[in-house]
């Protein structure tokens, strides 16, 4: 047994990473700003195995994945590239941002759309 | 900020309570036994507000709610009665056990059915 964290009060802690699900619907930029104001960033999937509980998260929430206009590739907020083994990206509508939608699937969306969002704080 | 727990390794910690989602499908009795073997019990909803993250959990998982044959009432594993403000119980098929199905809804099921399950360890 052991302690998890540290995390902001009432956040979820898993493998020393902190997560919070926010009900307010915001644009991607607003969601990013909200996470930053809480010393965190939008959700990043770095390992299906280590973040396995996320496969059961229902509905659609902004995550920290954006498309680079120059070459159309997708990258995380921290600048790292999206890897095929992190999640499946379903590109249907035109959009440069993405929502997380359970079972490690993400869906492209217009960044101006309003959605709930997930903030995350990686373990140091 | 603060630490959460203590919890078994790799469990989810929220408000000092510990949760784990198990992928193996078992009967209700087998699920209960699995949780007990890990010094925990099947999921109990005691407060929508304090367990708000559970509203986003998709799929259907055994929880610690059973029907008392004598009077048809529903109670938790710890013997306390189900309260209307804890969750909404949808009585679909005949069954004396219940699965948790997101948004604080539970669905009755035959206890011999196979389902995934959620174990929980209350904060001391």
């Amino acid at each position: 047994e052991g302690y998890c964290g540290p995390c902001p009060n009432n956040w979820i802690c898993h493998r020393n990473n902190c997560y919070q699900f926010f009900n307010e619907e915001k644009t991607w930029n607003q969601s990013q700003a909200s996470c930053l104001s809480q010393n965190s960033s939008l959700l990043k999937i770095y390992s299906k195995e280590e973040q396995d509980f996320l496969k059961l998260v229902k509905s659609y929430h902004w995550m920290g994945l954006v498309q680079i206009p120059a070459n159309g590739s997708w990258q995380w907020e921290d600048g790292s590239s999206l890897s095929y083994n992190q999640l499946t990206l379903v590109e249907i509508p035109k959009g440069s941002c993405a929502v997380y939608g359970s079972s490690f699937k993400a869906y492209t969306e217009d960044c101006a759309n309003l959605n709930t969002y997930i903030c995350m704080k990686r373990a140091v | 900020e603060g630490y959460c727990g203590p919890c078994p390794n790799n469990w989810i910690c929220h408000r000092n309570n510990c949760y784990q989602f198990f992928n193996e499908e078992k009967t209700w009795n087998q699920s209960q036994a699995s949780c007990l073997s890990q010094n925990s019990s099947l999921l109990k909803i005691y407060s929508k507000e304090e367990q708000d993250f559970l509203k986003l959990v998709k799929s259907y998982h055994w929880m610690g709610l059973v029907q008392i044959p004598a009077n048809g009432s529903w109670q938790w594993e710890d013997g306390s009665s189900l309260s209307y403000n804890q969750l909404t119980l949808v009585e679909i098929p005949k069954g004396s056990c219940a699965v948790y199905g997101s948004s604080f809804k539970a669905y009755t099921e035959d206890c011999a059915n196979l389902n995934t399950y959620i174990c929980m360890k209350r904060a001391v």
């Epitope: 496969k55 509905s59 659609y60 499946t88 990206l89 379903v90 249907i92 939608g101 869906y107 959605n115 | -």
Partner: antibody, heavy 117, light 107 residues
Framework: QVQLQQWGAGLLKPSETLSLTCAVY????????WSWIRQPPGKGLEWIGE???????NYNPSLKSRVTISVDTSKNQFSLKLSSVTAADTAVYYC???????????WGQGTLVTVSS | ELQMTQSPSSLSASVGDRVTITCRTS??????LNWYQQKPGQPPKLLIY???TRESGVPDRFSGSGSGTDFTLTISSLQPEDSATYYC?????????FGQGTKLEIK
């Protein structure tokens, strides 16, 4: 161009198990959920459930205790089994690609399943 | 489960008319609302997703609007081939649910 083709028994007796299969041709199989939806004669549409390539399933709680959806990734096929059928299960059953938030498209041609003694 | 209320259940209109069908949900679903057209003996066809985005190949006389709990499908100038039943569907929450349908007839 993704196309779905479905088949299975069209006439069942009460208490039997309905069994349908849907094959996916073209496009990505792994990137989506694959759904079953039914429509009783002259009535509306009811979502039954869905599965993805990894076997992850979501079911309608009203049918969950009788439904099994499975997948065969080697053939790009997914199947529906509905046990203990009654006359109330008489419907046209459709398979469809579930595009997450963006609706169901395309659809299979539909299979009329009649339950009668 | 999330309830979908569609109105009217049926309507009759003339070629060239502007037709509006509404869909109301029992709770907010953001813009995760899709519209389908179904003709007799055929599977439904996706017309609109994300409340207002036309599916590829759908004529621009079809448009969708709304967010939250109230949504509208509009056919700006009715054509004979638009005679069909129209369904709304929410993709916000499982189980996915459909409206009861609106049967549109051409006078």
């Amino acid at each position: 161009q993704v196309q779905l083709q479905q088949w299975g028994a069209g006439l069942l007796k009460p208490s039997e198990t309905l069994s349908l299969t849907c094959a996916v041709y073209g496009g990505s199989f792994s990137g989506y959920y694959w759904s079953w939806i039914r429509q009783p004669p002259g009535k509306g549409l009811e979502w039954i459930g869905e599965i993805d390539h990894s076997g992850s399933t979501n079911y309608n709680p009203s049918l969950k205790s009788r439904v099994t959806i499975s997948v065969d990734t080697s053939k790009n096929q997914f199947s529906l089994k509905l046990s203990s059928v009654t006359a109330a299960d008489t419907a046209v059953y459709y398979c469809a690609r579930a595009r997450g938030p963006w609706g169901f498209d395309p659809w299979g041609q539909g299979t009329l399943v009649t339950v009668s003694s | 489960e999330l309830q979908m209320t569609q109105s009217p259940s049926s309507l009759s209109a003339s070629v060239g008319d502007r037709v509006t069908i509404t869909c109301r949900t029992s709770q907010s679903i953001s813009s995760y609302l899709n519209w389908y057209q179904q003709k007799p003996g055929q599977p439904p066809k996706l017309l609109i997703y994300w409340a207002s985005t036309r599916e590829s190949g759908v004529p621009d006389r079809f448009s969708g609007s709304g967010s939250g709990t109230d949504f509208t499908l509009t056919i700006s100038s009715l054509q004979p081939e638009d005679s069909a039943t129209y369904y709304c569907q929410q993709s916000y929450d499982i189980p996915y649910t459909f409206g009861q349908g609106t049967k549109l007839e051409i006078k």
